[in-house]
Amino acid sequence: AGVFELQIHSFGPGPGPGAPRSPCSARLPCRLFFRVCLKPGLSEEAAESPCALGAALSARGPVYTEQPGAPAPDLPLPDGLLQVPFRDAWPGTFSFIIETWREELGDQIGGPAWSLLARVAGRRRLAAGGPWARDIQRAGAWELRFSYRARCEPPAVGTACTRLCRPRSAPSRCGPGLRPCAPLEDECEAPLVCRAGCSPEHGFCEQPGECRCLEGWTGPLCTVPVSTSSCLSPRGPSSATTGCLVPGPGPCDGNPCANGGSCSETPRSFECTCPRGFYGLRCEVSGVTCADGPCFNGGLCVGGADPDSAYICHCPPGFQGSNCEKRVDRCSLQPCRNGGLCLDLGHALRCRCRAGFAGPRCEHDLDDCAGRACANGGTCVEGGGAHRCSCALGFGGRDCRERADPCAARPCAHGGRCYAHFSGLVCACAPGYMGARCEFPVHPDGASALPAAPPGLRPGDPQRYL
């Protein structure tokens, strides 16, 4: 287990012509924040794939307002490191995406608005416990300078954070074949099975099956004292055990090679053998080549055969950026109709429609009766944010396509029975009531509250509602 740490040093215009406009203005002050996404290995992965090693979000930076007429300076940054904890072993090779986000603080409806300013991506080799590695990445006209490192969390140690440290069992020293856990000198490495026969006093191992010698000792099992010939050019204090001067600090002590480079001594100084993707005297320069697969989203890498020559990503349609990590702004074609707000989500375009409009591109006008036929003789009524059909008798539903049950509302009063009829409904009234809906009582003397019934209809007969 351990933590990947990212320190942003600066974000601002890159060198060369075409300085970018400041992302903030007096009318629209803003502040920056950063997101880092880590993935293990150097595999070809799309920018949208999960951050399997972890991700982190920075705090918000100070509020920034552009000075009118001034070029965009390096923008104020959030305080502190971005830390991505990892639970398992550090993989040694990893891919990263660092995004610079802008939070606009103007009068936004519904709170602040966020937009992606820049995204850089790369693939690197890095040993845990090593020094900070510095990097510069460009995204369009912007330049991001940052450093990163991976460090182990106790009790883990080693370049992959796989070795463990344990509290000492004896007060003064560690057991055979073990050594103190720097920087936790009061702890010892947990036992590792070193090569058979490796001297428990003068040898140790970082990986199972190896035998590495303490200063002053040599040989495959660290049982041979360093030859007295090394006393001819002494570099350190006298050894009481051999009477010879033991070599003191050498040019490779502390490993001056960054980014997982291995150090070897030369007659005058030292030499770093750098892992692929790094070069320079101390492997401090990250020279990503096409072999590292720097192009996202199916981009084609050209050039960059060796670390000193730059690579170029030829991006497939729909992608852009130095690593094909950015999508083209499809919203510039204004696909949303009727004033809808366009959102390019990457995997899809979305339109946020104004009130009264609907559909994937806001193409349906909910208030509009034009071209919206109400079936079965219904008439369209506008208003209230939606169109509505006023249906003819016997029909219902949004478009008057459903046959209505005229008896559903129990229209017959005073216990009358309702019958559906092709032209509406018929009420069969209970004794003592009459009328289309059985709403009128029949007077005891036989007279009715209604005018005389039409010929052939007696009080109590079903009254047809026309």
Epitope: Q334, P335, C336, R337, G359, P360, R361, C362
Partner: nanobody, 120 residues
């Protein structure tokens, strides 16, 4: 699936003219928006001209008065007539279309790209 097939483009002297065409075919219910994007060396891809979802014709500031966008609805085809070409018009021109494949499903499609090179 919808296909966009581009034609036209090529090498021309500054001040010359070229015409690009882009034909959409496949399962098309209707075309919502369609246009041309340009990707110049070292620059981001940008809209050159096209018709929007609301049917308006839109041009980039840098091409107004020189380029003319037109469409043939019956053939599902758009054209870009480029006059008074300048070296800065050099780049790969991509046709793009926002297409309804049925009443409620819409997707974005890109053409294969056409190289336009304007020599000074």
């Amino acid at each position: 699936q919808v296909q966009l097939v581009q034609s036209g483009g090529g090498l021309v002297q500054a001040g010359g003219s070229l015409r690009l065409s882009c034909a959409a075919s496949g399962s098309i219910f209707s075309i919502n928006a369609m246009g041309w994007y340009r990707e110049a060396p070292g620059k981001q891809r940008e809209l050159v001209a096209g018709f929007t979802g609301d049917g308006m014709t839109k041009y980039a500031e840098s091409v107004k008065g020189r380029f003319t966008f037109s469409r043939d609805n019956a053939k599902n085809t758009v054209y870009l007539q480029m006059n008074s070409l300048k070296p800065e018009d050099t780049g790969v021109y991509y046709c793009a279309a926002d297409v309804f494949t049925d009443r409620d499903h819409v997707d974005w499609y890109w053409g294969q790209g056409t190289q336009v090179t304007v020599k000074p």
